[in-house]
Each structure stands twice: as structure tokens, then as C-alpha cells.
């Protein structure tokens, strides 16, 4: 495929990758399920200012971001090492909450309403952001 | 590095227009929301207007809802606001600042100056 | 409309002092809650955002807090370079407020 070289209609760049804020909630594999059909993933936060960035857009909601441990160890959906990177959690977090009555601890991580992350329950509906490099090769063809 | 710079202000009659400018630099200008904020002289900050990083939403204080306009060229890294109308009441310095929810950056001001 | 009170309006200190200023909303809202610093004749400079966030080059003995509607900013020892006005400002909805400011003046 070609090297996308701008971002899709609806789609915000910043620091050479695109990023989609959703309008409504879903679930967190729901969300991870609808960026990766948009050939993304949910976000990846790597440093302070991609931090601020996503903050800018998604004011005081709650949204899902590419992080969990429902498989054990706390791991980035793009394969990010989590120990070494950057974070960003409100004191005390992550917890593995079990005390919610919904069955289970907490396996997803989303931004709080200051933007500072939290653990929560996987299946609650939240806003998601999509995120996508801009110099990753796109899926069409190439023209002939 | 993160530049803003506002240009456009002056000495102007009451009822006159006068339209601010604010150039963008060292940052994606079409990714970010954009607000104007005002200081009259000795005063403190009260907010103007606001705009999405695509244009698509506006909104005003009701202190200018009706005579001030903000618009934005992306092509031209350059945030616009056209004030019409205007009052001895409107005197102040404006800033652009970046961002909605937070002003992160802001532009050194312009001075605009209504008075017969 | 949601209101905002900053208090107090003006405040005398001395370097190594630790100063709290405070912002209470008149409403339990979801919104963004940010403090400016601004100096004679300068545009105002963001120090904290969304309430707890420093901003970037801001040094650490500022910080922020909320308890419901009331938000503070506290610098823990004051510096000669702080003497400043300090605004808090909310964004809510639509529209956005600042507080009527605190100006922070040598004792």
C-alpha cells in the first residue's frame, strides 16, 4: 500500500499521526473493534504534550484509551512497552476495583474528567479516541 | 516553537468596525480550537469567543453575541475576529489563545481603542 | 450561568511563604478548571489545567486541587519571580469564565 500522507476527513493530526474523538460510548472492545475496522487502534499515549493534545479535544468525559491488563500485565494495544512509557494515573490508580458489583476488578484504562487516568470496568460505554500514524502504509491498492 | 501574533487593533469611532487577525505558527493550527479574550485597561480577563478547530462550532458572551464574528482560514494559519459596532465598552487589549478547555498558548494582545 | 468567586482579591506575602488562592463554582459541573498567571503588560501564562495538571515548564511548587466546588492553588514556598495576578477560569458548556483575579504583592 501508499504511505498516507494526510489524515481523513473528520480525522485530527498531531505530531504525525491522526486521531478520531467519538460523540458517543461503547464498551472498551467495542471500541477497540471499531478503530482497528478504521485501520487505527485506540490511543496510545506516549508523552505529555500527546497527553495535552488529547485533552484539548476531549474536555471532562470519560474516554477509553489503549490500555488494559485484562490478560494480566497493564499493555498497550499498539504493543508499547507500558513499564518504561509514559503515564499518567490518578493517585492510588490503578486499583482492580471489585467493590463496583459488576463482577470482576477493573481491566480498562480511560481519561478522567481532569484527564488523568483511572481503571475501570471494561464494559461501561464510554467516548474512545482512534488513533493512526501518518506514515503507516494504507490499506488500498496502489494506482497503476 | 509555539507562536501566536495578533495584529489589527487601533483608535476607532464608536459604531465603526475593525476585524483582528492572529497568525499561527510552530504548531498544526487546524487541530486545535481557538478563543479570543479581552482585557480592558486595569480590568480583568472576560472571555470573548470561541471556535472548533474546523470552524464548525462558534459560540459568544453575551456581551458581544449579535456585533463580533470570529472565523478562522486553515490554509493560512490565521484566526479572525470582525467586531462591528463596536462601543467605548469594548476598549481592551484582545489575545488569541489556543485551545478550548484550556488556553495553553497566547499571542502578546492588541490594543483596540474605541473612542470618538 | 455558572458563577465563579476568587478569593481573596489581593494578597501580601513574603518570599518562602506557602499562599492559597481559591476559586469556588456555584455548581458541582463537569468542566475544566485552569489558573493563569499574568504580569504587568504580558499576556497571561497557563500554570495549571483541568484543575491538578502543571503545565509544562511550570515549576513544581505550584499545584492544584478540588474539593467539589471549591478549587485552590497553592504555591508551596513563593519566589520573587511569582508575584503576580492570578486568574482561575472555568470552562463549562459553552461558555467560559474567569475569576476577578488575585494580585499577589510583596509584604
Known amino acids: 500500500g501508499s504511505e498516507r500522507t494526510c489524515c481523513p476527513v473528520n480525522w485530527v493530526e498531531h505530531e504525525r499521526s491522526c486521531y478520531w474523538f467519538s460523540r458517543s460510548g461503547k464498551a472498551w472492545a467495542d471500541a477497540d473493534n471499531y478503530c482497528r475496522l478504521e485501520d487505527a487502534h485506540l490511543v496510545v499515549v506516549t508523552s505529555w504534550e500527546e497527553q495535552k493534545f488529547v485533552q484539548h479535544h476531549i474536555g471532562p468525559v470519560n474516554t477509553w484509551m489503549g490500555l488494559h491488563d485484562q490478560n494480566g500485565p497493564w499493555k498497550w494495544v499498539d504493543g508499547t512497552d507500558y513499564e518504561t512509557g509514559f503515564k499518567n494515573w490518578r493517585p492510588e490508580q490503578p486499583d482492580d476495583w471489585y467493590g463496583h458489583g459488576l463482577g470482576g476488578g477493573e481491566d480498562c484504562a480511560h481519561f478522567t474528567d481532569d484527564g488523568r487516568w483511572n481503571d475501570d470496568v471494561c464494559q461501561r460505554p464510554y467516548r474512545w479516541v482512534c488513533e493512526t500514524e501518518l506514515d503507516k502504509a494504507s490499506q488500498e491498492p496502489p494506482l497503476l | 516553537q509555539v507562536q501566536l501574533v495578533e495584529s489589527g487593533g487601533g483608535v476607532v469611532q464608536p459604531g465603526r468596525s475593525l476585524r483582528l487577525s492572529c497568525v499561527a505558527s510552530g504548531f498544526t493550527f487546524r487541530s486545535y480550537g481557538m478563543h479570543w479574550v479581552r482585557q480592558a485597561p486595569g480590568k480583568g480577563l472576560e472571555w470573548v469567543t470561541i471556535i472548533s478547530y474546523d470552524g464548525s462550532n462558534k459560540y459568544y458572551a453575551d456581551s458581544v453575541k449579535g456585533r463580533f464574528t470570529i472565523s478562522r482560514d486553515n490554509s493560512k494559519n490565521t484566526l479572525y475576529l470582525q467586531m462591528n459596532s463596536l462601543r467605548a465598552e469594548d476598549t481592551a487589549v484582545y489575545f488569541c489563545a489556543r485551545g478550548v478547555w484550556f488556553g495553553d498558548f497566547w499571542g502578546q494582545g492588541t490594543l483596540v481603542t474605541v473612542s470618538s | 450561568d455558572i458563577q465563579m468567586t476568587q478569593s481573596p482579591s489581593s494578597l501580601s506575602a513574603s518570599v518562602g511563604d506557602r499562599v492559597t488562592i481559591t476559586c469556588r463554582t456555584s455548581?458541582?459541573?463537569?468542566?475544566?478548571l485552569n489558573w493563569y498567571q499574568q504580569k504587568p503588560g504580558k499576556a497571561p501564562k497557563l500554570q495549571i489545567f483541568?484543575?491538578?495538571s502543571l503545565e509544562s515548564g511550570v515549576p513544581s511548587r505550584f499545584s492544584g486541587n478540588r474539593s467539589g466546588t471549591e478549587f485552590t492553588l497553592t504555591i508551596s514556598s513563593l519566589q520573587p519571580e511569582d508575584f503576580a495576578t492570578y486568574y482561575c477560569q472555568q470552562t463549562y458548556g459553552t461558555s467560559i469564565t474567569f475569576g476577578q483575579g488575585t494580585r499577589l504583592e510583596i509584604k
Open positions: 483541568a484543575a491538578y
Open positions: 455548581q458541582n459541573s463537569n468542566s475544566y
